[in-house]
């Protein structure tokens, strides 16, 4: 019960922090530009991975795509190659993990299965999380290297009056949105992973072992027990109290002549 | 620190055409139009031409240079042009580019200048 509360919740935790981070991404709100020292301020301008918006003091606000004219820094599009990996990945963590999901059952899929599948979706999660994490603190970074503090003399309109304002770009809020989205979706990484190890058949468990008499075809099933006999010989590496007892897959698979009790 | 660069500026003759190029050291983030702004002696620093990420559809000029001046952009070349042609002794002054914010009605400059190039009109 535990393992699929585990489960569910790593989902559900990974869920949210992947629409955080599609979210994020598709925000203009990376970089804000805040002005002062102004009587009359005449814009207010932000930015995006994808484009700049300008909000005039009359509330006219218009968005526009990047001016590539100059080209666009090799920063920015590490980031946003940073943050469409982390949805990629997040995205296809998502679909193995509603088939890895405990309470969803799909035809006749083992536990192992499950528990590879689990594992798979976490590492996912974890690796999304930690590309979303990466991409908002290198434009972080950028702007606070790049842009901090930086003064601006401001001419509004054709032919317009020198109108002079000190600029200072600040973090938008898609940052914090990232950072928690990423840190989300590592989260849930981790808690699926977690889960995997509740979900995994362990080695000690109790298999159903085929036993073969010489001469006979008859294969008898212990009730789920595991019997060691000390005989047989131990050339796969098995451990010895394996003995010579197979389950019924390594029967099919592995015929021997030498299984006798 | 990315640097714009004018050059083109001269002296000429009324009547006459030039052509101003702005180039840079380096891409610009967050930037969505290029300006050009004249400063007259004696007079404040304005806006002429300006050019938005729409392309060359996409551009505003003062009224004073309308239909004479025109903003283009070489995206191979990474240039901003502005070919002024009918050149008037008015239009002497010191040309800046500008790399900053266009919308519909209007363009804002960002924090990036060239460093001018001086433009002579005799008459």
């Known amino acids: 019960m535990a393992v699929t509360a585990c489960q569910g919740l790593g989902f559900v935790v990974s869920l949210i922090g992947i629409a955080g981070i599609i979210a994020a991404t598709c925000m203009d709100q990376w970089s804000t530009q805040d002005l002062y020292n102004n009587p009359v301020t005449a814009v207010f301008n932000y930015q995006g991975l994808w484009r700049s918006c300008v909000r005039e003091s009359s509330g006219f606000t218009e968005c526009r795509g990047y001016f590539t004219l100059l080209g666009l820094p090799a920063m920015l599009q590490a980031v946003r190659a940073l943050m469409i990996v982390g949805i990629v990945l997040g995205a296809i963590g998502l679909l193995v993990s509603i088939f890895a999901l405990k309470c969803i059952r799909i035809g006749s899929m083992e536990d192992s299965a499950k528990a590879n599948m689990t594992l798979t979706s976490g590492i996912m999660f974890i690796v999304s999380g930690l590309c979303a994490i990466a991409g908002v603190s290198v434009f972080a970074n950028m702007l606070v290297t790049n842009f901090w503090m930086s003064t601006a003399n401001m001419y509004t309109g054709m032919g317009g009056m020198v109108q002079t304002v000190q600029t200072r770009y600040t973090f938008g809020a898609a940052l914090f949105v990232g950072w928690v989205a990423g840190g989300l979706t590592l989260i849930g990484g981790v808690m699926m992973c977690i889960a995997c190890r509740g979900l995994a058949p362990e080695e000690t468990n109790y298999k159903a072992v085929s036993y073969h008499a010489s001469g006979h075809s008859v294969a008898y099933k212990p009730g789920g027990f595991k019997a060691s006999t000390g005989f047989g010989s131990n050339t796969k590496n098995k451990k010895i109290y394996d003995g010579g007892a197979r389950t019924e897959d390594e029967v099919q698979s592995y015929p021997s002549k030498h299984d006798y009790v | 620190q990315v640097q714009l660069v004018e050059s083109g500026g001269q002296s000429a003759q009324a009547g006459g055409s030039l052509r101003l190029s702005c180039t840079a050291s380096?891409?610009?983030?967050?930037?969505?139009?290029m300006g050009w702004y004249r400063q007259a002696p004696g007079k404040e620093r304005e806006l002429i031409a300006a050019?938005?990420?729409?392309?060359?559809?996409?551009?505003k000029y003062a009224e004073s240079v309308k239909g004479r001046f025109t903003i283009s952009g070489d995206y191979a070349k990474k240039t901003l042009y502005l070919q002024m042609n009918s050149l008037k002794p008015e239009d002497s002054g010191v040309y800046y580019c500008?790399?900053?914010?266009?919308?519909?009605?209007?363009?804002?400059?960002?924090?990036?200048w060239g460093q001018g190039t001086q433009v002579t009109v005799a008459a």
């Open positions: 050019i938005g990420s729409g392309g060359d559809g996409d551009t």
């Open positions: 380096g891409s610009i983030f967050g930037i969505s139009g």
């Open positions: 500008n790399a900053g914010f266009m919308t519909s009605r209007n363009y804002y400059n960002g924090d990036y």
